[in-house]
Amino acid sequence: MGRARDAILDALENLTAEELKKFKLKLLSVPLREGYGRIPRGALLSMDALDLTDKLVAAYLETYGAELTANVLRDMGLQEMAGQLQAATHQ
C-alpha cells in the first residue's frame, strides 16, 4: 500500500472518537462518483481508524479514497486536515 493510504490513516487517527463517529455517519451519505458503491452501514460503524482506512482503499482505491476522505473532512469543518491529507497524497 502507498502514500495515499498512509495519509488517510494519519488523518483518521487524528480524529477524536466523536469526530470519527461523525466521519462514518457523513460517509454514509456523502455524494459519490458514478460507478462507486457505498460501504454498508453495519460494517462501517464498528470499524476503528485502521479498518476504516483499509475499507476505504478497498472500496474506492487510493486516489479516490483519499479525495473522498478529504471531502468528508471538509464537510466536518476540518478543511486544514483535508488540505494536509491531499498535500501528502500529491507529494
Epitope: 451519505s29 456523502v30 471538509r74 464537510d75
Partner: antibody, heavy 114, light 107 residues
Framework: QVQLQQPGTELVKPGASVKLSCRAS?????????????LEWIGNINLSNGRTNYN??FRAMATLTVDKSSSTAYTQLSSLTSEDSAVYYC?????????????WGQGTSVTVSS | NIVMTQYPKSMSLSIGERVTLRCKAS??????VSWYQQKPEQSPKLLIY???NRYTGVPDRFTGSGSATDFILTITSVQAEDLADYHC?????????FGAGTKLELK
C-alpha cells in the same frame, strides 16, 4: 427554522473591546460586513469540542470562545478602530455536506466612536 | 487565500427576465461553493450549496451549476422579491472566503 439569537447593537470607544454572543450549535461562524461591503469570514468554533479556525487577518483582534452549558458562542473583538464598525453575524453550518452557512443570526451592529 | 471574483457587480433588469450571475475561484474548490441572497437590512440567506444543491424552501427558479473554478447562479424568471445582493462563498479551504457580491436592481 433554527433562530440564532444575537444582541442588536453595541456602541464602543476606539481602543476598547466588545464581546459579542450568539446562541447556536455545531460549527458557529463569525462574519463581518461593513456598510455597503461584502462578507468577511472572521473564524469559526465547534461548540461541541471547542475547536477553532481563524482568518489570519482577524487573529490578533478576535478571540472565539464557547460556553457549552448555555450553547453560546462568543467573539471578543479587541483594540477596536473605526474600521471595525460593521455588522457582525454569527452563522451555523448544519447541512451535512459541503459546509455552507445555512442559519444566520440577525447580526449585531457595532459602532466604534468616541 | 482563495479569491472569489463575482461579476457583474450590478445588473439592472426587468421582472420575468432570465439572469446569470457568475463567480470565479482563484483555484480549484471542487463543488464547495454556496450562494447567498441578502436583502437590505437583512442577514444573508442560503440559496444553493455544493454548487448545485437547492437549499430547503428555495424556489426552483434558482439554479446553481459549475465546479472547480467557474460557478453560475441562474434565476430563470426574476421576481420582484429577488431584487437583492447575491454573494458566492467557498468552503473548500480556510479561510472561508466570499465574493464581493452582485446587486440585482430594477431597470
Amino acid at each position: 427554522q433554527v433562530q440564532l439569537q444575537q444582541p442588536g447593537t453595541e456602541l464602543v470607544k476606539p481602543g476598547a473591546s466588545v464581546k459579542l454572543s450568539c446562541r447556536a450549535s455545531g460549527w458557529t461562524h463569525w462574519v463581518k460586513q461593513r456598510p455597503g461591503q461584502g462578507l468577511e469570514w472572521i473564524g469559526n468554533i465547534n461548540l461541541s469540542n471547542g475547536r477553532t479556525n481563524y482568518n489570519e487577518k482577524f487573529r490578533a483582534m478576535a478571540t472565539l470562545t464557547v460556553d457549552k452549558s448555555s450553547s453560546t458562542a462568543y467573539t471578543q473583538l479587541s483594540s477596536l478602530t473605526s474600521e471595525d464598525s460593521a455588522v457582525y453575524y454569527c452563522a451555523n453550518s448544519m447541512v451535512p455536506h459541503f459546509f455552507p452557512m445555512d442559519y444566520w443570526g440577525q447580526g449585531t451592529s457595532v459602532t466604534v466612536s468616541s | 487565500n482563495i479569491v472569489m471574483t463575482q461579476y457583474p457587480k450590478s445588473m439592472s433588469l426587468s421582472i420575468g427576465e432570465r439572469v446569470t450571475l457568475r463567480c470565479k475561484a482563484s483555484e480549484n474548490v471542487g463543488s464547495y461553493v454556496s450562494w447567498y441572497q441578502q436583502k437590505p437590512e437583512q442577514s444573508p440567506k442560503l440559496l444553493i450549496y455544493g454548487a448545485s444543491n437547492r437549499y430547503t424552501g428555495v424556489p426552483d427558479r434558482f439554479t446553481g451549476s459549475g465546479s472547480a473554478t467557474d460557478f453560475i447562479l441562474t434565476i430563470t424568471s426574476v421576481q420582484a422579491e429577488d431584487l437583492a445582493d447575491y454573494h458566492c462563498g467557498q468552503s473548500y479551504n480556510y479561510p472561508l472566503t466570499f465574493g464581493a457580491g452582485t446587486k440585482l436592481e430594477l431597470k
